[in-house]
Interface confidence: medium
């Protein structure tokens, strides 16, 4: 349905307050440096502009498309070329190719500094200014995450604001917020981790990608849906997600809100799950529709294999109509296994499409692919073999000591990664132990694997900025459903050339007595990649040995009355004693 | 729910023609595989003809292939089943069946399809 003008469009569907701050999440996500009140001036001038747009649509300008109207935005920022130096270059192109090159421009990993929560700070920002906290915390997130899913931010920024609501007014204001933002920073974490796996699958692997994990995905949800309303449901969600991670955020929201209408009107047919959410006002209803557990599988569903290996139809069902049939194969495969990953599902699929391939082309195709289930074990066996291997470690380990496992197996595969990379990446999988672990056998594959996806997915994008490991890269672009499997699979690097030793690295001050647990960890974990780096060789006793060592320094000269002192005469002791060990 | 209605059938003599019809209510017949099977006395059903939902893939038994064609016609949600040459071991029940929300496959196996009609009676006999 085409409007005259585009922006009034939007500003009428969305409403001023969820059209600010999409305009203002999409400002902040393309120009990650600079200040807030520079970013609500801008927002500022195109809502007045949508206003006037609204009271008349004819009014000059107002049928401008939506690219055009932001990219001219922020082509007025005067200190473009200073702060982005070759973005300003892409204020010389015509649309479409000038919103191109400014979602080329976006920086996964933006030189910002950490949000360190100070409770009273906060409770007086909010309570000056509710609206602005608002936006604070919008432009704040967006900045740093620049493929945070837009209308989900929205969700989180409200939510942000209502523990402020509830806390500001509590007696130990820190005991209130800080283990309720810290709950909602892990789950923000985890939220942008997933769109950026969802937008790096589109970008590297096109919308295909997207549609058959969401046919999976959806599939395991709703497994009472038919095929054609679940394959509905996946061509307006890619719709969606297409748009978001292509900066189109007010489109992106709206389609998002006429979605989550959609399925509340026909949840009869999709899910007996759904009645909650759909009481819910939009956001909540969208968030809850997104976290919806997996409803019932139907009974008496008849055996995949009927369909899919004793049928003698199969290679002309195939042949005549390969998307359909595969995507029939996923998605009756995805709802009778609620237990399975989708990343297996997805190389279940594969597997089957690579099967049929062979099968199809030979005088007796029935015979070749009446076994293909048997052929398929053995992707589900993989996974679960890992899952109990890892676990078993984690739980003799616990996270801290997992995580450290974690960064020798990882720092000798890929030794030419950046430390703060190694370190990064190896401390989120060692998280999995934390949240995957514990969970029931039922749910461990699906926590595991997924998460595994965007932890992987992490590394290849930061990877993609500077490529140093034509291993990473390999696994990173062959097979997006095979890249964990890959990595996996990675043995240690024989061709690396060790890194001279350098003391400045081990070289440590008092100010890192005073730091939090988990900073003197990362510390610690980056000593640790840094001396494998050095020694890749270092057999596990020896290891051992250095970081007890190290941490024997730390904690005798964080004790000492003059710790600068301490540091500066034990340090130098602790690299000699350090290649000692290593010797 | 899928409510599905043959008629057609009838007493044709061998070599004649007869067109059956199936008209579907409760969901478009285009989004549903959909086929016909047929039923002797004292004999089990037996697959004769199919067309997938969303694709118009056509599946047929060996014994009808060439003679029966298996069509739809969506704006009417009616499935057909034309049939030419027939013999006198074509005499049986002739059933509509219904496998919603399936893409394009059209299994052979009865059990597989949730949905049928009452039947419609086809006898080829001089």
């Known amino acids: 349905d085409t409007h005259k003008s585009e922006i009034a469009h939007r500003f009428k569907d969305l409403g001023e307050e969820h059209f600010k701050g999409l305009v203002l999440i999409a400002f902040s996500q393309y120009l990650q440096q600079c200040p807030f009140d520079e970013h609500v001036k801008l927002v500022n001038e195109l809502t007045e502009f949508a206003k006037t747009c609204v009271a008349d649509e004819s009014h000059a300008g107002c049928e401008k498309s939506l690219h055009t109207l932001f990219g001219d935005e922020l082509c007025k920022v005067a200190s473009l070329r200073e702060t982005y130096g070759d973005m300003a270059d892409c204020c010389e192109k015509q649309e479409p190719e000038r919103n191109e090159c400014f979602l080329s421009h976006k920086d996964d990993s933006p030189d910002l500094p950490k949000l360190k929560p100070d409770p009273n700070t906060l409770c007086d920002e909010f309570k000056a200014d509710e609206k602005k906290f608002w936006g604070k915390y919008l432009y704040e997130i967006a900045r740093r995450h620049p493929y945070f899913y837009a209308p989900e931010l929205l969700y989180y920024a409200n939510k942000y604001n209502g523990v402020f609501q509830e806390c500001c007014q509590a007696e130990d204001k820190g005991a209130c917020l800080l283990p309720k933002i810290e709950t909602m920073r892990e789950k923000v974490l985890a939220s942008s981790a997933r769109q950026r796996l969802r937008c790096a699958s589109i970008q590297k692997f096109g919308e295909r990608a997207l549609k058959a994990w969401s046919v999976a995905r959806l599939s395991q949800k709703f497994p009472k849906a038919e095929f054609v309303e679940v394959t509905k449901l996946v061509t307006d969600l890619t719709k969606v997600h297409k748009e978001c991670c292509h900066g189109d955020l007010l489109e992106c929201a709206d389609d998002r809100a006429d979605l989550a209408k959609y399925i509340c009107d026909n949840q009869d047919t999709i899910s007996s799950k759904l009645k909650e959410c759909c009481d819910k006002p939009l956001l909540e209803k969208s968030h809850c529709i997104a976290e919806v557990e997996k409803d019932a599988i139907p009974e008496n569903l008849p055996p995949l294999t009927a369909d899919f290996a004793e049928d003698k139809d199969v290679c002309k069902n195939y042949q005549e109509a390969k998307d359909a049939f595969l995507g029939s194969f996923l998605y009756e495969y995805s709802r009778r296994h609620p237990e399975y990953a989708v990343s297996v599902l997805l190389r279940l699929a594969k597997e089957y499409e690579a099967t049929l391939e062979e099968c199809c082309a030979k005088d007796d195709p029935h015979a070749c692919y009446s076994t293909v289930f048997d052929k398929l074990k053995h992707l589900v066996d993989e996974p679960q073999n890992l899952i109990k291997q890892n676990c078993d470690q984690f739980e003799k380990l616990g996270e801290y000591g997992f995580q450290n496992a974690l960064i020798v197996r990882y720092t000798r595969k890929v030794p030419q990664v950046s430390t703060p990379t190694l370190v990064e990446v190896s401390r989120s999988l060692g998280k999995v132990g934390t949240r995957c672990c514990t969970k029931p056998e039922s749910e461990r594959m699906p926590c595991t694997e997924d998460y595994l996806s965007l932890i992987l997915n992490r590394l290849c994008v930061l990877h993609e900025k500077t490529p140093v490991s034509e291993k990473v890269t390999k696994c990173c672009t062959e097979s997006l459903v095979n890249r964990r499997p890959c990595f996996s699979a990675l043995t240690p690097d024989e061709t690396y050339v060790p890194k001279a030793f350098d003391e400045k690295l081990f070289t440590f001050h008092a100010d890192i007595c005073t730091l939090p647990d988990t900073e003197k960890q990362i510390k610690k974990q980056t000593a640790l990649v840094e001396l494998l780096k050095h020694k890749p060789k270092a057999t596990e006793e020896q290891l051992k040995t250095v970081m007890e060592n190290f941490v024997a320094f730390v904690d005798k000269c964080c004790a000492a009355d003059d710790k600068e002192a301490c540091f500066a005469v034990e340090g130098p002791k602790l690299v000699v004693s350090t290649q000692t060990a290593l010797a | 729910e899928v409510q599905l209605l043959e008629s057609g059938g009838g007493l044709v003599q061998p070599g004649g023609s007869l067109r059956l019809s199936c008209a579907a209510s409760?969901?478009?017949?285009?989004?549903?595989?959909v086929a016909w099977f047929r039923q002797a006395p004292g004999k089990g059903r037996e697959f004769v003809a199919g067309?997938?939902?969303?694709?118009?893939?056509?599946y047929y038994a060996d014994s009808v292939k060439g003679r029966f064609t298996i069509s739809r016609d969506n704006s009417k949600n009616t499935l057909y089943l034309q049939m030419n040459s027939l013999r006198p071991e074509d005499t049986a029940v002739y059933y509509c069946?219904?496998?919603?929300?399936?893409?394009?496959?059209?299994?052979?196996?009865?059990?597989?399809?949730?949905?049928w009609g009452q039947g419609t009676l086809v006898t080829v006999s001089s």
């Open positions: 069946a219904a496998r919603p929300g399936r893409p394009l496959i059209t299994s052979k196996v009865a059990d597989l399809y949730p949905y």
């Open positions: 409760g969901r478009y017949i285009d989004e549903t595989a």
């Open positions: 067309i997938g939902g969303g694709v118009d893939i056509t």
